[in-house]
């Protein structure tokens, strides 16, 4: 809190300009009018104020706008944004994508801070859904943004926004998130032809059900092992050896290196050993010949 002191003679600020740069904290408090600051916020970023000085400027804006800053001020906060707390930001009503971009630009190089998370939350809630332009902007600044959302939040993403998603944006998504995103991606890319469709859908396949994997196996897609290893175990288990062979194409040889890891390990345990032998990869652990396989889950369903 800055003490209230009278402004020295001749130091009253008539505009926000570089003459303020060496004002002490108390001089800024006493000599800069908050309303003037609010109307000339765009000038603040052109002046290398120290963080101590920025604290004073923030204090003045807080006094002027106790209910939260108007968007005209927010848009020009510049690196004063770094001084805002999540509590400050919760009072804002940010509707312009340009304002969001301006503030994300200031935060570039930082991890996603609680301030930024709050800002994005306020913005998205205000819009009602995560539209394509917003998603484009957010993933450009924070590739991991999508995977920071809960499955419930992801459900508000319209399929049209999926076009903005890049493979690296999904790197940290867990299966629950991909379960939500995959059907949206399938819908978004449904009019593409086989090979183009696979390129686009590939990074979402961690949410794909068995029947979609079976369908892909008929299309010569040559899925790489990294993608295969991210598939849902429950979706991979029902696939036959022939289907996995078709799905992976030349990459099928990679199964050997992954035979101890899920989902490959669990899939091997479900296959007949003589079927696995047809691959010629030396995969071991399948069901020995002559054994009968009872699908207990099917039995339970019938009873």
């Amino acid at each position: 809190e800055v003490e209230k002191t009278a402004c020295p003679s001749g130091k009253k600020a008539r505009e926000i300009d570089e003459s303020l740069i060496f004002y002490k904290k108390w001089e800024l408090e006493a000599c800069v009018d908050a309303a003037l600051l609010a109307t000339q916020m765009d000038r603040v970023n052109a002046i290398p104020f120290t963080y101590e000085q920025l604290d004073v400027l923030k204090h003045k804006l807080d006094e002027l706008y106790p209910q939260g800053y108007p968007e005209s001020v927010i848009q020009h906060l510049g690196y004063l944004f770094l001084k805002m707390s999540p509590e400050d930001i919760r009072k804002w009503n940010v509707t312009s994508l340009e304002t969001l971009k301006a503030l994300l630009e200031v935060n570039k190089g930082h991890e996603m801070s609680p301030q930024v998370a709050t800002l994005i939350d306020r913005f998205v809630k205000g819009r009602g859904q995560l539209d394509k332009d917003t998603l484009d902007t957010l993933t450009a600044f924070y590739p991991g943004y999508l995977c920071s959302l809960s499955p419930e939040e992801l459900s508000s993403v319209p399929p049209s926004s999926i076009w903005a998603v890049r493979p690296q944006d999904l790197d940290t998504c867990d299966p629950r998130q991909l379960d939500v995103l995959y059907p949206k991606a399938r819908l978004a890319f449904q009019n593409m032809n086989g090979s183009e469709y696979f390129v686009k859908i590939q990074s979402f396949l961690g949410g794909a059900p068995t029947e979609d994997l079976k369908a892909l196996s008929q299309q010569n897609v040559s899925m790489d092992l990294a993608t295969f290893m991210k598939l849902r175990t429950d979706a991979v288990l029902p696939l036959t050896v022939a289907e996995v062979q078709k799905l992976l194409g030349p990459h099928v040889e990679g199964l050997k290196a992954e035979e101890r890891h899920r989902p490959v390990r669990d899939w091997i345990l479900r296959q007949r050993q003589d079927d696995l032998d047809t691959l010629g990869l030396g995969l071991q652990g399948g069901i020995p010949n002559g054994y009968l396989v009872l699908d207990l889950s099917m039995q339970e369903a019938l009873s």
Partner: antibody, heavy 118, light 106 residues
């Protein structure tokens, strides 16, 4: 890309004068605050002088106040440091540096050596 | 505001994790930058706002801290990292630098 090139350094006797120049390119010079920072041989960095983008606001370290004058010519993309009444303790490499929106030094020149010795 | 760096010099090997500290004489929020200077060269900005990596700086460099105590960490020292490192505060004028930490080859 951003380039800052200092010149004007050299050997001068105590009490003498020198004028350092810094030619800037690759950025909008007139938008940036500029600084002179010096480094005595084997020592750390000392912020010597600062000039605002228009040239109307200036700072000097106490150690050079009254002896050094910073100026700029935005039309020529140039920064200057006029050094008078030089002392042995002014011996240093002098760097010009641009200030980003934060008061820190984003881009530096390669430096010019000033030696004050009789 | 005075900045005190420690140690003033250290010896380390390629691959080592190196930590340099900078202590401010009073609280400076997160208004701290780190620079690297190689012999005969100008300093180069590495980190600002205590922890933000300047564009183009390798991710093995990281900064942390707030208030009075700050740290620069090099997670796995590379041959090109042998240099002198300086901290600088920009919480209040006049802007000041730490005395430097020289990182030498063991």
């Amino acid at each position: 890309q951003v380039q800052l090139v200092e010149s004007g350094g050299g050997l001068v006797k105590p009490g003498g004068s020198l004028r350092l120049s810094c030619a800037a390119s690759g950025f909008t010079f007139s938008d940036y605050y500029m600084s002179w920072i010096r480094q005595a041989p084997g020592k750390g960095l000392e912020w010597v002088s600062y000039i605002s983008s228009s040239g109307s606001t200036i700072y000097y370290a106490d150690s050079v106040k009254g002896r050094f004058t910073i100026s700029r010519d935005n039309a020529k993309n140039s920064l200057y440091l006029q050094m008078n009444s030089l002392r042995a303790e002014d011996t240093a490499v002098y760097y010009c540096a641009s200030t980003s929106p934060r008061p820190l030094f984003q881009h530096w020149g390669q430096g010019t050596l000033v030696t004050v010795s009789s | 505001i005075q900045l005190t760096q420690s140690p003033s010099s250290l010896s380390a090997s390629v691959g080592d994790r190196v930590t340099i500290t900078c202590r401010a004489s009073q609280g400076i929020s997160s208004a701290l930058a780190w620079y690297q200077q190689k012999p005969g060269k100008a300093p180069k900005l590495l980190i600002y706002d205590a922890s933000s990596l300047e564009s183009g700086v390798p991710s093995r460099f990281s900064g942390s801290g707030s208030g009075t105590d700050f740290t620069l960490t090099i997670s796995s020292l590379q041959p090109e990292d042998f240099a002198t490192y300086y901290c600088q505060q920009f919480n209040s004028y006049p802007l000041t630098f730490g005395g430097g930490t020289k990182v030498e080859i063991k």
